[in-house]
């Protein structure tokens, strides 16, 4: 029950996170005009990953797309790439996790397969969240650098009297949405990975070992461990039966209806 709850919650948290990453990527307010200590203007500038906008006090808003690829800063391109990779991985992760949900039955899919899928989606969510956090952080760093550069030469005097006010940009709402969304996706991914450990079936069931050796019965040593999911480090562990009937490396098996005699 706890595993199902953890998996379900992980899925929901990741879903919200990925929706947030998509929203942040599409938002225009990645950077907004810094109003502090600036002359009050009737025009407010803000910029996104895909276009820049100008909102006038009259309410009129005009947005212009960046219709060039080569002319854009490499950092902006990198941020775009990170966000898109985050969205793609997150979307794939969501698809995988839907099929991995314990509460959803698909054919005769075994718990081991669901465990694998849960871990796969969990890792995808973690990477997706990290991509979003990295993208937003790179953009934020770019803003901070530009902010202090423009502050250093904010007023460039022209003949003493005439001044040009340099527009400074500060953090926009999209950055905070991106950070929170990336964090949620990351948390959701971790929850999925935790759920995966619970989903993987315990191999503590007594397996039938049917053979004769030296005319006396073979004692079964318990001390089993969780079934390998294919992603763990326990694939090389061997569960040795007295008499050396078989190892998990030779025949990796999970409890099924045929295991019980």
């Amino acid at each position: 029950m706890a595993v199902t709850a953890c998996q379900g919650l992980g899925f929901v948290v990741s879903l919200i996170g990925i929706a947030g990453i998509i929203a942040a990527t599409c938002m225009d307010q990645w950077s907004t005009q810094d109003l502090y200590n600036n002359p009050v203007t009737a025009v407010f500038n803000y910029q996104g990953l895909w276009r820049s906008c100008v909102r006038e006090s009259s309410g009129f808003t005009e947005c212009r797309g960046y219709f060039t690829l080569l002319g854009l800063p490499a950092m902006l391109q990198a941020v775009r790439a990170l966000m898109i990779v985050g969205i793609v991985l997150g979307a794939i992760g969501l698809l995988v996790s839907i099929f991995a949900l314990k509460c959803i039955r698909i054919g005769s899919m075994e718990d081991s397969a669901k465990a694998n899928m849960t871990l796969t989606s969990g890792i995808m969510f973690i990477v997706s969240g990290l991509c979003a956090i990295a993208g937003v952080s790179v953009f934020a760093n770019m803003l901070v650098t530009n902010f202090w550069m423009s502050t250093a030469n904010m007023y460039t005097g022209m003949g003493g009297m005439v001044q040009t006010v340099q527009t400074r940009y500060t953090f926009g709402a999209a950055l905070f949405v991106g950070w929170v969304a990336g964090g949620l996706t990351l948390i959701g991914g971790v929850m999925m990975c935790i759920a995966c450990r619970g989903l993987a079936p315990e191999e503590t069931n007594y397996k039938a070992v049917s053979y004769h050796a030296s005319g006396h019965s073979v004692a079964y040593k318990p001390g089993g461990f969780k079934a390998s999911t294919g992603f763990g480090s326990n694939t090389k562990n061997k569960k040795i039966y007295d008499g050396g009937a078989r190892t998990e490396d030779e025949v990796q098996s999970y409890p099924s209806k045929h295991d019980y005699v």
Epitope: T41, A42, V43
Partner: antibody, heavy 118, light 113 residues
Amino acid sequence: QVQLVESGGGVVQPGRSLRLSCTVSGFTLTSYGVYWVRQAPGKGLEWVAVVWAGGNTNYNSALKGRFTISKDNSKSTLYLQMNSLRAEDTAVYYCARDRGRLLAMDYWGQGTLVTVSS
Amino acid sequence: DIVMTQSPDSLAVSLGERATINCKSSQSLLNSGNQKNYLAWYQQKPGQPPKLLIYGASTRESGVPDRFSGSGSGTDFTLTISSLQAEDVAVYYCQNDYFFPFTFGQGTKVEIK
């Protein structure tokens, strides 16, 4: 067609208050910003205040908070409350509509004269 | 506050001749976000309210004759009347539409020589 009609002007003593009105037609105050601009006799234009479509306001800091701009959208009327009037406030007061894009005053009223005199 | 300085204060031009009025602002009126200049030009005839001629430094308001043109960017702007007509006798004002308060120039009186 767009029209702006100012009213409420007249002779007032220094230190007293006066409220000017500007009734608009042909457009709504929820869609356009409206300004008050004044012109002292024989002098140039001086920007007084603006109330934007959304209700935000901006003032000429030189007027030191004596003037207050407001509007009643349902009555399509703009107001300018002028307190602690001085002789230098004597002027023709115009209301003008903001054109929307690139912020310029495209339609003007005929103006109302305010004379501050003892 | 932004100071708008017009030159000359008055201008006498023969009919059909070109009239040029300059306007200088104490700070740039060019917005980096959309590369637009927030400056307007108005014409005021005696006993009348001002009339908008040019906005955005160079865009002519509808109904304004094409002999009126605006140019310039940043801090220096110009209003040109390519061929002065008798009805163009008026006072012309430039206005900062970027920084609050929206200041006007002192005005330039255009007369016929």
